[in-house]
């Protein structure tokens, strides 16, 4: 009988194409249950039905059909806690990173029809159910409204709202992007009695104005109150209104702690502790002092009390308070003590237990690694994530601490579940953590699973990306390595993406992808098939990502190294890494490039202009070019103020423009969207002007009416095609 001809698997596989990336052919799915009780959740199915699941009875049924969704073109939904109503969201219209407006319809599940009468106005800026029953709070034209029931007339809570001037219940631009990272600034108390909200007064903030070309005869001008470094900031006030009788008392203002109110300050977050206790966090404009203030409702005077002995101060002596943001407290069942992540005496972020004062805090975790997020505190357990396991900063595992035990015992829930496939997890917990979902992002194919909150046993696989696994079978994927390199007393973690038939004895072009912003992390054990995967797979380019000083989760000494001197060590460490990669022997020294977006565009620009001759070419997409052009909250957190008596000198020294002459010996591609609300086009305009003034040749591309993400399909295609051509030309790779 004839023997079968053996074909090595490698020959049957194809390389990735740019088209694969642009079409999202190899995108993965995750599954996050929308928890509605201890053992029940909702999920939107592939065909857009909203399905109810009960883990214990194993029942599942369609709670809202796709035809009902389709009848109002709904793309999202929200079930009221009493399960009588669902809001349907349609006409989604993106504003900034988190914010959008939409049209909302209320569907009555009992009688199977939409609620008529007192329909909601449109477009609404934010809408949410109360945590109990079916009260609705929403923001329309910068004012907050309340409905006791969906069919009731609305009660207007605030009257001060004014476009681009005063925002109630929603953040202004800078708070949305740099402080809250949400589209909302209102919070219901757990029993739905009180509603807390923030008023942002932007009346004195300078306006950034840019053209939006559209397709009309005249462009329109977008105006955004946007405080750049050193400018006037929003004035914030926090109010609480009793929603049972909102007309009787009116919103009450919550006082700012005196030590904060004595100079410019920020509100940073609000956490309801119980139905009559609330916790507010405040931050000085010089962001090294944060105050957590616990306030109680007093029935006798119907007033909010924030006693001084319930103020807890967190201060950094080596940099700024917190990580990227100041952490939020996770309160115990006693509604008095809480768990919080902040730096320990060795400068590593760890979980601390605060009972009375921060000085008497009990450290719960410790070591030369960092606790990253507290997911849930229950009667007997605390669930958190960290990068402790095996000493890899770019991993995330979920741990459980049994707080009932003395001393508390720690268990890694995820470390050994699917060790090769999964090293980077997040979690989603049901009420009281009776059940939880784990979502693994890599390094292998992402997988989502359901677990018992008592035993940690896996109950069910929710999504394992089987289709993706099958479609990747015939693809030549690059090899990914995560390792560390040492230089002097410093350790830098890097990720290297190697072409499929990588041979150490050969020479390859190298592309450095950089972000490098303070408290960011690029070297993560996650799965991705993206542009750089394609460059390695098809074009034979070695890609490297390096986490230099200023990046996160490796202690404050490493993190705070960049404090008040952005643009120095981030660049230096990329250069150090490139030299180390050259020493490895497989890099073609004549073909090294660097690229980055946003903060990465800033670092790539400075690296190209470092005068080292290491780079042949590079790309900066939407780069910051001067910290004076960027948002106050961000710039000042890391750089202080651009004033003579503070840090003006380094603000001036750290610009890309100051290094214009040094671009003469590199090929530079500068790219920016003209409607970038975040890193304004101004940044690239100033780089271009400085290069022209210095008579330095460079390439540039703008994307009309595109924002910081350059997200429109056509623009993305053009952008990545353009960058690919540029790189291939730089590396002398044939088309």
């Amino acid at each position: 009988r004839p023997s079968r001809v053996y074909k090595p698997e490698g020959n049957t596989k194809r390389a990735l194409t740019l088209k694969d990336i642009l079409n999202g052919t190899f995108s993965y799915k995750t599954y996050f249950p929308n928890w509605i009780s201890e053992q029940e959740y909702l999920h939107q199915s592939e065909d857009d039905n909203i399905v109810f699941y009960n883990i214990e009875t194993r029942e599942s049924y369609i709670i809202l059909s796709n035809s009902t969704m389709k009848s109002v073109n709904a793309t999202d939904y929200g079930l009221s806690p009493d399960r009588q109503f669902v809001y349907l969201e349609s006409d989604y219209s993106k504003l900034w990173r988190y914010s959008y407006t939409a049209t909302y319809y209320i569907y009555d599940l009992q009688n199977g029809e939409f609620v008529r009468g007192y329909e909601l106005p449109r477009p609404i800026q934010y809408l949410c159910w109360s945590p109990v029953g079916s009260k609705l709070a929403y923001v329309y034209q910068n004012n907050i409204y309340l409905k006791q029931r969906p069919g009731d007339p609305p009660f207007q809570i605030t009257y001060t709202g004014r476009e681009n001037r005063i925002f109630n219940g929603i953040p202004d631009w800078v708070y949305e992007e740099e402080m809250l990272a949400t589209k909302y600034a209102l919070w219901w108390s757990p029993d739905g009695k009180f509603l807390a909200y923030v008023e942002f007064n932007d009346s004195d903030i300078p306006i950034i104005a840019y053209s939006y070309y559209g397709d009309g005869q005249y462009p329109r001008t977008i105006n955004i109150p946007y405080p750049k470094a050193g400018a006037k900031n929003p004035v914030v006030r926090v109010f609480i209104v009793d929603t049972t009788y909102p007309h009787h008392v009116g919103p009450m203002e919550v006082p700012v702690p005196e030590m904060i109110a004595s100079s410019d300050y920020y509100f940073s977050w609000l956490t309801w502790v119980s139905s009559e206790r609330v916790c507010l966090q405040w931050l000085k404009r010089v962001q090294n002092v944060s105050v957590l203030s616990i306030c109680d409702f007093r029935e006798d005077w119907h007033a909010w009390e924030c006693p001084k002995n319930q103020e807890h101060v967190e201060e950094s002596r080596t940099g700024w308070a917190g990580g990227f943001f100041v952490s939020t407290p996770a309160f115990s069942q006693d509604a008095t003590s809480y768990y919080k992540i902040f730096s320990d005496k060795d400068g590593y972020k760890h979980i601390h237990y605060i009972k009375d004062t921060v000085e008497n805090a009990i450290q719960i975790t410790s070591g030369k690694w960092e606790a990253i997020y507290i997911f849930r505190v229950t009667q007997d357990s605390l669930f958190y994530s960290s990068n402790e396991f095996e000493g890899y900063p770019g991993r995330r595992n979920i741990y459980r601490i049994s707080i009932g035990n003395s001393p508390p015992s720690k268990k890694c829930v995820t470390c050994h579940l699917r060790k090769e496939r999964c090293q980077y997890y997040t979690a989603s917990f049901s009420y009281k953590a009776k059940y939880y979902a784990l979502v693994c992002y890599g390094p292998g194919l992402p997988i989502s699973t359901l677990h018992d909150g008592r035993t940690d046993q896996e109950i069910q696989v929710l999504e394992e990306n089987k289709e993706l696994e099958n479609s990747l079978r015939n693809i030549q994927l690059p090899k990914v390595e995560i390792k560390k390199l040492k230089d002097g007393g410093l350790t830098f973690w890097y990720k290297m993406i190697l072409p499929p038939q990588f041979d150490r004895s050969k020479k390859y072009p190298l592309l450095i992808q950089v972000y490098g912003g303070p408290c960011s992390q690029s070297v993560k054990s996650v799965f991705a098939v993206n542009w750089i995967t394609y460059l390695a797979s098809k074009e034979g380019i070695v890609i490297a990502l390096v986490d230099g000083r200023g990046t996160a989760f490796q202690g404050d000494k490493f993190l705070h190294a960049v404090y008040r001197k952005l643009g120095v060590y981030e660049v230096e460490d990329q250069l150090t890494a490139v030299r180390k990669f050259i020493e490895m022997g497989f890099i073609d020294e004549e073909r090294i490039a660097i690229w980055g977006w946003s903060y990465g565009g800033y670092v790539s620009s400075l690296a190209l202009a470092s005068g080292t001759g290491l780079f042949k070419c590079g790309i900066a997409v939407a780069p910051v070019s001067s910290w004076e052009y960027y948002a106050s909250i961000y710039s000042e957190r890391f750089m202080g103020l651009p004033t003579k008596d503070d840090n003006l000198e380094h603000y001036k020294n750290s610009t890309v423009m100051a290094r214009a002459e040094y671009f003469r010996n590199v090929d530079y591609l500068l790219i920016h969207g003209t409607a970038d609300d975040n890193v304004h086009f101004q940044n690239s305009a100033q780089i271009a002007k400085a290069l022209v003034n210095a008579q330095v040749d460079f390439q540039a591309m703008w994307y009309s009416d595109q924002n910081h993400g350059i997200l429109s399909g056509r623009s993305q295609n053009h952008l990545y095609t353009h960058m690919t051509h540029f790189l291939k030309q730089c590396f002398s790779l044939s088309d």
Epitope: R237, F239, V249, G250, P251, M252, E253, V254, P255, V256, P257, E258, C295, R298, W301, A303, W304, E305, C306, P307, K308
Partner: nanobody, 121 residues
Framework: EVQLVESGGGLVQPGGSLRLSCAAS??????????IGWVRRAPGKEEELVAR????????RYADSVKGRFTISCDTSKNTAYLQMNSLRAEDTAVYYC????????????WGQGTTVTVSS
């Protein structure tokens, strides 16, 4: 030193009106940490907080017994709070005290010396 000084009390017929004033010194009534209240004491009756205001927000609260008849307000430029009393009844007769409470030190109440209101025909 914090001081609250009331004025405006007196004798008035049922159905009449009076306006009580409370001038504050030693703290700022427009601070969000400050609440000003009017408390009345009458022989044989329990002390009653008839109205309170947080001047920073304008949030007010009234005892059911005076709702719709009394209005509490403040003039932050004068650092003074007022109680406008309309449709007065015999049962409104009492000594009216201005009280100040600060959120940071809630348990402590600053008191004025009191002003007497007598409603009688």
């Amino acid at each position: 030193e914090v001081q609250l000084v009331e004025s405006g009390g007196g004798l008035v017929q049922p159905g009449g009106s009076l306006r009580l004033s409370c001038a504050a010194s030693g703290f700022n009534i427009k601070d969000s940490s400050t609440y000003i209240g009017w408390v009345r004491r009458a022989p044989g009756k329990e002390e009653e907080l008839v109205a309170r205001i947080q001047c920073s927000s304008g949030s007010t609260r009234y005892a059911d017994s005076v709702k719709g008849r009394f209005t509490i307000s403040c003039d932050t430029s004068k650092n003074t709070a007022y109680l406008q009393m309309n449709s007065l009844r015999a049962e409104d007769t009492a000594v009216y005290y201005c009280a100040g409470r600060q959120s940071y030190n809630y348990g402590y109440i600053y008191w004025g010396q009191g002003t007497t209101v007598t409603v009688s025909s």
